[in-house]
Structures are given as C-alpha cells and as structure tokens.
C-alpha cells in the first residue's frame, strides 16, 4: 500500500498585518482514517491551531468543506493576521484511535508578516547647544516586519551621513524595530532648520514615512552686545543704548548698572523675529549727566537663556562737559563676548 | 555559525539562588527549544528543563519546584533560575539548542555552550 | 520518566578497530510518525557534548561516516567503523521522545 504523504506546496507565506492566510494542506490518500490537525511549531511546545473535531478557533476556516466525503484538502484560512502569528505551521494526520496517534506531519509552512512600521519619532537633545557645537538627535520606529529598513536623515532637504543605525532584535522575531541617532553640527543660521528621518519598507509602498525636529528646540544663538551714547542732550541728559542683536531663543533679562547698582531691569517679550528666527532687542538708559560728581559706570548686563550674564560697561565722563558729545569718549568691558567701545 | 554563551557567578550560597543567563549570538531563537543541562563533577548529563521559543517552559520534574526558565527575545538571551541550592547543584551548566522540525518529538540538541562551572559553597 | 542504559561503562578501543555502544530504554522512543526520538553525543575531555546522531540513525552535520546509528524502539547501537584518536571521550545516548529529556550513563571510550 501506497505511504500516506502530507503535502504542504508552500515552505513559506507572506501576509500583510491585517490580512488573511491561507495554509495549503493536502493528503495523498484517504486511508487510515483519522482526523488532520493544524500546528504552529513542533516538538512538546507546539500550538494546536486548528483541530475539525474539538475546540473554538474562531479566526481560522477550513478552506474546503473537511466533512465532505473523499475530502483530501485540508488548507485553513486564519483571518486577521497579526506579527504575533508568524511562525512555522504544521499539517499533522492522526491515526484513529483512543486516544488518536499522529501518523504523519507535513514539511511546515513558515508565515512571515508583513506590519508597517510606526510612525518615526524624532526627539533631540536634553539642552541647547551653541553654533559649532554638535548635537545629536534620536529617530525610533516599531513594530514592523520583515526586518529589512531603510532610514535616511536630512537636514533642509540635505541627506546627512553622520549617523548610526540599529535595528532589533539582531535574531528572527514577529517584528522589529529601527533606532538611529544622527549627529548635526549646529550653525548660527540653523533656527529655521529642521531634520527629517525618513523610513521606506516594503509594507509602505515606496511611500516612506517621516518624523520631523525642529532645530529651534535644540540651539541657543547667543547675542551681540554694543554699548552706545547718543549726542548728549541739552538738558544735560545723556542717552545710553544697549543693543542687544541675533539671540535665540526669546527668553532674555537686561539689567541696567549704575556704578554697580541696579538701576533698572527688563524682560524681553513679544519681540519681532527677524529673517533668520533670531531677534534684536534695544534698551535705552537715560542718565542726568549734572546729578553726578564723578564719572558714571553704566553697565548693560544680559542673562540670556539661563547663560552666565554678560556684560557691556561704558563710562560716562562727568569732569568735563561739551556741548556736544557726538561719540563715546571712554568704555570699559567686563564679561564674555565683549569688545571695546571708543 | 549560531554560538551560545553562559554567563552568570561561579559561585553560590547555600540556600541562594543560582542565576545563569545564556546568551544566543550568530542566529534566531525562533522555532528552537533553550536547554539547560548540568553535569555535576565526575558525573554524567542531566536535563534541566527548556523553553521553546513561544514562552512554553518544561522542567525536569526532580527539579521542578525550584527552576525557572525565562526567554528575552529582544536580547537574544534565556535564563535559568534555581532557587534554595545546595552542594548537591555544584556541577558545569551548559545551555544548548533544540532542533524541532515536525512531529511531537525533538531533532537533536545541536548547539551547547561551553559551559560555566557553579560551585556552591558556603 | 524513560530510563535509558547504557553499555560498556568503559570501551578501550584500538585505533582503525571498530568499536560498538548499546543503548536500551525502558520504553518505545519508536514514534506513530515512524521516528525513533533517540540522539548520540560525544562529549571529548574538557569539552562540551557534541550531537553525533539524531532520530535514531541521522548523522549531524560534519559528522564522520565512521559514525553510524541503528535499532529502533528500544534498543540502539551507535557503531564506529574505525576508532581515531580523537574519538575519545565520554558517549551519551539520549532519549528525545518525551520530557523530562533523559541520558543515558555514558560510555567512556579510551585508547588502548
């Protein structure tokens, strides 16, 4: 007599997440009786699947009706495929019996599923960064299958190539995921900038996926400082400007010194941006030139971003008074960032 | 080439528990069994238990009620856990690989670590 | 739990000889699917084991073909057609039907 053959066509089967799958399964003779069941895996761990008899399996459907008499066919359909259903799949013929002996498998079919990847999540740094200082920015998407990815950075429609790339796990799972870290060198310039990951799969049909950062919430442009005297006034007030120029982000406190002693303090708000994204912001301190014996310090003080303050001073001479006091006669600097003013 | 590699500390308390993490490299955990075996000094195998790669765990029921075996598929790594050891657990644990293709039984432990020797000793 | 036996104990062989292991359990490892759920390792002096042979008669890959398995439900033989010297070391059979796993004894083979 002709030895029973289980006859499984496909070694494997792609499906998208979502979808159905069909598992074909055949047996080359009627005889013996016995029932087929369907296996995911082998060995004492495996999971009944599908079992005609016994049981509930309600996302899996015989393709053919298996109480059809001369029935050879015992393909089953199992609906709403998940990552969590890949596996290799075993059509088992079972010898009547009490209980029933299993006679024969089939080679296996290993499903595999196709699951798109999540949409990328684009975080940056913890702190802001400074011009010329390197900031490093995070792209992670999950759970797709099969493992092959492709993820590519950009920055303003530029491809960037400082970076690294890990997909997990490194062995076969139901799914997968992608992290990336690339590295950006920041620009004064770079406000309006922003960085794109993109992920292109199988699953996404040549339409890839993007997570976007802005590098807004990654740099600080620290600001220029001059100190300047306008013409002194008749009245024998002279006008002291501090402007303050090309700073980002917004968040800026001025004080104003007077010998050492605050005279005034002021917060940047609602400031115009400027082409770039950074702003410009002017303070102006009137001081009365003949309430004062000695020559006056004024000194601009700016605390930027919670940075160390910096500091402008430019003295006002007092011993002599012109007429017309067109430009600076002397300055001295303290703090980071200064130059002289004459 | 898949290889494996025991890890974890060579010795033990009395009473404590042995932890040993086997690490997989070079392959997939997919569609395996995860063995733990040991050999005590001089002595020949005894099977420990296994995990197959669907979480399912089975025990050498002489040990049973103190072994767990766990599987961390995103690491690549299974784990074995033996609570209230004794001398009598002092041995070389070895973690291995199981072939199952079809059918209810197994096609072969192919793949052992080197094995990591645990001595437990006060 | 199936107890698997195992003899000799002890085999001093002579290189280019043949030498022959038995292998009995104490029940069928003879399956209804028509394999024999029955393994061979070699494990060499500070070595790991090694699988020689599995369902009963498969050589493993990278196997000698010196190295043959045969019997079937309960007794097995693991047979040598011409010992080398790297073939010693201890020789486990085990059963691989049902859990618990089970060895048997082991066979030391040694060079005469």
């Known amino acids: 007599e002709e030895e029973l053959q289980v006859i499984q066509p496909e070694k494997s089967v792609s499906v998208a997440a979502g979808d159905s799958a069909t598992l074909n399964c055949t047996v080359s003779s009627l005889i013996p009786v016995g029932p087929i069941q369907w296996f995911r895996g082998a060995g004492p761990g495996r999971e009944l699947i599908y079992n005609l008899k016994e049981g509930h399996f309600p996302r899996v459907t015989p393709v053919s009706d298996p109480t059809k008499r001369n029935n050879m066919d015992f393909s089953i359909r199992i609906s709403n495929i998940t990552p969590a259903d890949a596996g290799t799949y075993y059509c088992v013929k079972f010898r009547k019996g009490s209980p029933d002996v299993e006679l024969k498998s089939g080679a296996g079919t290993e499903l595999s599923v196709r699951a798109k990847p999540s949409a990328p999540v684009v975080s940056g740094p913890a702190v802001r960064a400074t011009a010329e200082h390197t900031v490093s920015f995070t792209c992670e998407s999950h759970g797709f299958s099969p493992r092959d990815i492709t993820l590519k950075w950009f920055k303003n429609g530029n491809e960037l190539s400082d970076f690294q790339t890990n997909v997990d796990p490194a062995g076969k799972s139901v799914s997968y995921s992608i992290r990336s870290t690339a590295r950006v060198v920041l620009t004064r310039r770079d406000v309006h900038s922003q960085v794109i990951c993109e992920v292109a799969h199988v699953t996404l049909q040549g339409d890839p996926l993007r997570g976007t950062a802005n590098l807004s919430e990654a740099i600080r442009v620290p600001p220029f400082l001059e100190v300047t005297q306008q013409s002194m006034r008749a009245d024998n007030q002279v006008n002291v400007t501090c402007q303050v120029t090309k700073f980002y982000p917004q968040r800026l406190q001025l004080t104003w010194l007077e010998n050492g002693n605050v005279s005034r303090t002021e917060m940047a708000s609602a400031l115009p941006e400027n082409k770039d994204g950074t702003y410009n912001w002017t303070s102006w301190l009137l001081v009365n030139v003949s309430a004062h014996r000695d020559d006056v310090k004024l000194t601009c003080q700016v605390e930027h971003d919670g940075q160390p303050a910096v500091n402008k001073s430019f003295s006002v001479k007092v011993s002599a008074h012109p007429k017309e006091q067109g430009s600076n006669t002397a300055a001295e600097n303290t703090g980071t960032n200064e130059r002289n003013i004459y | 080439q898949v290889q494996l590699q025991e890890s974890g500390p060579g010795l033990v308390r009395p009473s404590e528990t042995l932890s040993l993490t086997c690490t997989v490299s070079?392959?997939?955990?997919?569609?395996?069994?995860w063995s733990w075996i040991r050999q005590p000094p001089g002595k020949g195998l005894e099977w420990i238990g296994f995990?197959?790669?669907?979480?399912?765990?089975f025990y050498n029921s002489s040990l049973k009620s103190r072994v767990t075996i766990s599987l961390d598929m995103s690491m690549n790594q299974f784990s074995l856990k033996m609570t209230s050891v004794t001398a009598a657990d002092t041995a070389v644990y070895y973690c291995?690989?199981?072939?199952?293709?079809?059918?209810?039984?197994?096609?072969?432990?192919?793949?052992w670590g080197q094995g990591t020797t645990v001595t437990v000793s006060s | 739990d199936i107890v698997m036996t195992q003899s000799p104990l002890s085999l001093p062989v002579t290189p280019g000889e043949p030498a022959s292991i038995s292998c009995k359990s104490s029940?069928?490892?003879?399956?209804?699917?028509?394999?024999?759920?029955l393994d061979w390792y070699l494990q060499r002096p500070g070595q790991s084991p090694q699988l020689l042979i599995y369902l009963g008669s498969n050589r493993a890959s990278g196997v000698p073909d010196r190295f043959s398995g045969s019997g079937s439900g309960t007794d097995f033989t693991l047979k040598i057609s011409r010992v080398e010297a790297e073939d010693v070391g201890v020789f486990y059979c085990m059963q691989a039907l049902q859990t618990p796993l089970t060895f048997g004894g082991g066979t030391k083979v040694e060079i005469k």
């Open positions: 291995a690989r199981v072939r199952a293709y079809s059918g209810i039984g197994l096609d072969g432990t192919d793949v």
């Open positions: 995990i197959y790669y669907n979480g399912r765990t």
């Open positions: 070079g392959g997939s955990i997919r569609n395996y069994y």
């Open positions: 029940q069928s490892l003879l399956y209804s699917n028509g394999y024999n759920y």
